[in-house]
């Protein structure tokens, strides 16, 4: 298949540390034109991380995902991996992108292969305009605060690219299971697909086991510290950005030839006090916060801003 220009559109300056393959649903290589080869891993929560293809865990993860994809294909599933160019799909990202990661979709007039979009139920958390992202801008994303003591290999730090859409008309990043989006702090935007009308607070969720290896995207994250696992119901000990409405009409008319540019700006704001105490032992934030995006239909640009995820900081005790 002809992809048009093969300009590098995802640059990974920092690679993630280990992620269990159980939590991964997909992988993809970046383009040869990027110079530094990287594997783009998609997690069950539909977030993307750069990984070093030379690392053994990455090789093992890819091998496992290959087998899983083959098994699902035999069983009539739709799990899919893609090898080759990472090209944005027709809809730009609204999720975390980070650590000198630059996404530059090219207008080839073709249907793109990567379509990061937010879920329609996700909270509006975005910031206005920003300067364009230079390679080398340091952001932070993800939500893992590693336990202490910890071996030298910390959690995936500053490597998350963006959240890809839980449901999409394009098939290249589709996993074997549908995603019912839960509450989160990613920017909201309209898409051409109808949002779920289910009330997450009242409707009981049901699931059975028709096939093995179903992938369960999940919202909400717990943050670790001091080798402990308390979970306050709503505690947040990291900076949180105040709510800013996202442009909710931005995704409506993006076609295959649309251009998107990514910018990153640092954000500082006040923290929210915990409602419940965190168990003994302090925990220190790691540079791994989700990045929030908003779309400007005039500029056809994606603004990415690092914002701590309140859900991510949620712990229970």
């Amino acid at each position: 298949q002809h992809h048009g220009v093969t300009k590098c559109n995802i640059t990974c300056s920092k690679m993630t540390s280990k992620i269990p393959v159980a939590l991964l649903i997909h992988y993809q290589q970046n383009q040869a034109s990027c110079g530094k080869r990287a594997i783009i891993l998609e997690t069950r929560q539909h977030r993307l991380f750069c990984a070093d293809p030379k690392e053994q865990w990455v090789k093992d993860a890819m091998q496992h995902l290959d087998r899983q994809a083959a098994a699902l294909t035999r069983n009539g599933g739709t799990f899919e991996k893609q090898i080759g160019e990472v090209k944005p799909r027709t809809t730009p990202a609204a999720g975390g992108m980070d650590e000198s990661v630059v996404l530059e979709p090219e207008a080839t007039g073709e249907s793109s292969s990567l379509e990061p979009t937010p879920s329609s139920q996700e909270a509006q958390r975005a910031l206005g305009t920003s300067p364009e992202l230079p390679t080398g801008v340091t952001g932070s994303s993800g939500t893992r605060l590693p336990p202490t003591p910890k071996a030298q290999d910390g959690g995936p730090v500053g490597t998350e690219l963006f959240r890809v859409p839980p449901v999409s008309t394009a098939a290249t990043w589709q996993s074997s299971a549908p995603h019912q989006p839960g509450p989160s702090l990613w920017a909201e935007a309209k898409t051409s697909e109808a949002p779920s009308t289910q009330d997450p607070s009242t409707q009981a969720s049901t699931a059975s086991s028709p096939a093995p290896e179903e992938n369960a995207p999940s919202e909400g994250q717990r943050v670790w510290g001091q080798g402990q696992s308390p979970r306050p119901e709503n505690s947040l000990e990291r900076e949180e950005m105040g709510p800013v409405p996202a442009h909710t009409d931005a995704f409506q008319d993006w076609g295959p030839g649309s251009m998107a540019h990514v910018s990153v700006v640092p954000v500082s704001s006040e923290g929210t006090p915990s409602r419940e105490p965190v168990a003994s032992g302090s925990w220190t934030p790691k540079a791994e916060e989700p990045i929030h995006a908003t779309m400007d239909p005039q500029r056809l640009g994606v603004l990415i801003t690092p914002v701590p995820d309140a859900q991510a900081a949620t712990r229970r005790q």
């Epitope: 053994q56 019912q180 509450p183 369960a216």
Partner: antibody, heavy 122, light 107 residues
Amino acid sequence: EVQLVQSGAEMKKPGATVKISCKASGYTFTNYNIHWVQQAPGKGLEWMGWYLPGDDSPRFNERFKGRVTITADKSTNTAYMELSSLRSEDTAVYYCATSPTDETQGDYFDYWGQGTTLTVSS
Amino acid sequence: DIQMTQSPSSLSASVGDRVTITCRASGRIHDFLAWYQQKPGKAPKLLLFTDNTLAEGVPSRFSGSGSGTDYTLTISSLQPEDFATYYCQQFWSTPYTFGGGTKLEIK
């Protein structure tokens, strides 16, 4: 304090269906994975499947495929595990447990229910 | 599926002893391993997880080591309350699997 409280012991006949509940408290129910683990008498532990309340996309151990249904009632913070077509080898203690949902940490089980004993006998 | 083989299956020791339990995976699990302690009639309790991190409230006499496929749980100085059954669990890939257990008894 995090607590997972399971329903009481069950006695069932082969071919029947059992539904075990796991009521969670002390944390935001919809934010954490719930797992079910089986422990047959004198045997080790066997993972049955995971579920995130609020999602409809669980994952199961192939061994239990087709016989397990997991549901959740968010209004009562309760997860359920239903096992059908019971046979004598399903006699075991069933535990619910939670794991971190930070997608980079992995699923180790940090909190457990007290267990529900299921006896399957004709 | 990754099989987890624990050894020994049972072990007799005295208070104050140093005890080592090993767990071997049938494939690489990249340090995504947890150790649990279970006492009769009780649910398992998390001791250690990824990269040998001690869980909340677990005494420092418990430690873990290993990489690749071979892992070890060490209790540096056995206490009376440590006599129990110990399980390892890999969470690198699904289905998550446990070792067969090591029953630690008083000599």
